[in-house]
């Protein structure tokens, strides 16, 4: 690597992946092995983060980024960056400090995380049950009893492809 | 970058109704449930309900059941919250929260908050 | 339905620690977040899950719950954390809001 020339601050030739050695007369040194710097001028390089137990690599550390982590089956992610791996649940259960629980009858939940929500109420919004609710599903509505004129029929829509619920990053 | 961006300040007189919007950009729209809630001058943050914006479903306060209605157009990833039959006490900013992804239903963005006054 | 309670203010000097506690009926069983709302400014999520901080929020915040009481702790408080502070909890069928903290930094 060439010694930087820049007139204002030699540190900022440094390209990602390198650091500014202070103990080398300010030479861009590369990031030493497990470590890594995303953007240039760098004085120091970053630690890789490692994903280690219930974390796994979904992305190995490259001298300009860090390492992704994802979770192991049966685990999924919550925070920025997967910060965290938290418990799976099955649908129609949630997750509380003492594990999974089942949903209380007129709650539901959809996914494997999350909590038991109740029962959407459909009279609230001006329509009608189309399809009753169970601990997996929440109620589909449908058009208020009074836009049903005789003989016309209600077709049950197609469920969402997914609910909310929140995919890893 | 996640944002939510409300619609602007209201005036409305008392027995009116009042729509506010918040369209959402920087994330999956239909990934995340979408809530409302309010805050009176002076006063602490109430929850008035929520919206499920891939089927439309909603779960709304007691407090506001029968006066608010959560709505959604995901073309436009924008949810809707309207209430009817205003009141004074109703003025109040109101502000559209998304919810996170923490055990136990935590509220991680807000959009910037419309303020709704109500006066005669 | 479900209450949290928090004392209405709180005054620490610069540079020490300040507690805000959430009390509610064996609140230790729920998740309890926390929410720092500056004056004309949306509230911010700054501890979720009882302990843990989005990114962005300075390690000075913590939070701990057990028993009935939650505590957001705020180490070494600077001028800047001088706002109001809002624990929430989920309870069955509502998002339930404590009634809110000013902290004064003096």
């Known amino acids: 690597f060439e010694r930087t020339r820049s007139l204002q601050d030699p540190c900022s030739n440094c390209p990602a992946g390198t650091f500014c050695d202070n103990n080398r007369n300010q030479i861009c040194s590369p990031c030493p092995p497990n470590s890594f710097s995303s953007a240039g001028g760098q004085r120091t390089c970053d630690i890789c983060r490692q994903c280690k137990g219930v974390f796994r690599t979904r992305k190995e550390c490259s001298s300009t980024s860090n390492a992704e982590c994802d979770c192991t089956p049966g685990f999924h992610c919550l925070g920025a960056g997967c910060s965290m791996c938290e418990q799976d649940c099955k649908q129609g259960q949630e997750l509380t400090k003492k594990g999974c629980k089942d949903c209380c009858f007129g709650t539901f939940n959809d996914q494997k995380r999350g909590i038991c929500r109740p029962w959407t109420n459909c009279s609230l919004d001006g329509k009608s049950v189309l399809v009753n609710g169970t601990k997996e599903r929440d109620v589909v509505c449908g058009p208020s009893p009074a836009d049903l004129s005789p003989g016309a029929s209600s077709v049950t829509p197609p469920a969402p492809a997914r609910e909310p619920g929140h995919s890893p990053q | 970058q996640m944002q939510l961006v409300q619609s602007g300040a209201e005036v409305k007189k008392p027995g009116a109704s009042v729509k506010v919007s918040c369209k959402a950009s920087?994330?999956?729209?239909?990934?995340?449930?979408m809530h409302w809630v309010r805050q009176a001058p002076g006063q602490g943050l109430e929850w008035m309900g929520w919206?499920?914006?891939?089927?439309?479903?909603?779960n709304y306060a007691q407090k506001f059941q029968g006066r608010v209605t959560i709505t959604r157009d995901t073309s436009a990833s924008t949810a809707y919250m309207e209430l009817s039959s205003l009141r004074s006490e109703d003025t109040a900013v109101y502000y559209c929260?998304?919810?996170?992804?923490?055990?136990?239903?935590?509220?991680?963005?807000w959009g910037q908050g419309t303020l709704v006054t109500v006066s005669s | 339905s479900y209450e949290l309670t928090q004392p209405p203010s709180v005054s620490v000097a610069p540079g020490k620690t300040a507690r805000i506690t959430c009390g509610g009926n064996?609140?230790?069983?729920?998740?309890v977040h926390w929410y720092q709302q500056k004056p004309g400014q949306a509230p911010v999520l700054v501890i979720y899950?009882?302990?843990d901080r989005p990114s962005g929020i300075p390690e000075r915040f913590s939070g701990s719950n057990s028993g009935n009481t939650a505590t957001l702790t705020i180490s070494r408080v600077e001028a800047g954390d001088e706002a109001d502070y809002y624990c929430?909890?989920?309870?069955?069928?509502?998002?339930?809001f404590g009634g809110g903290t000013q902290l004064t930094v003096l």
């Open positions: 929260a998304r919810e996170g992804e923490a055990v136990g239903l935590d509220l991680d963005y």
């Open positions: 920087g994330y999956r729209f239909g990934g995340y449930y």
């Open positions: 919206i499920n914006p891939n089927s439309g479903g909603t």
């Open positions: 064996n609140i230790g069983s729920k998740s």
């Open positions: 899950y009882d302990s």
């Open positions: 929430q909890v989920w309870d069955s069928s509502s998002v339930v």
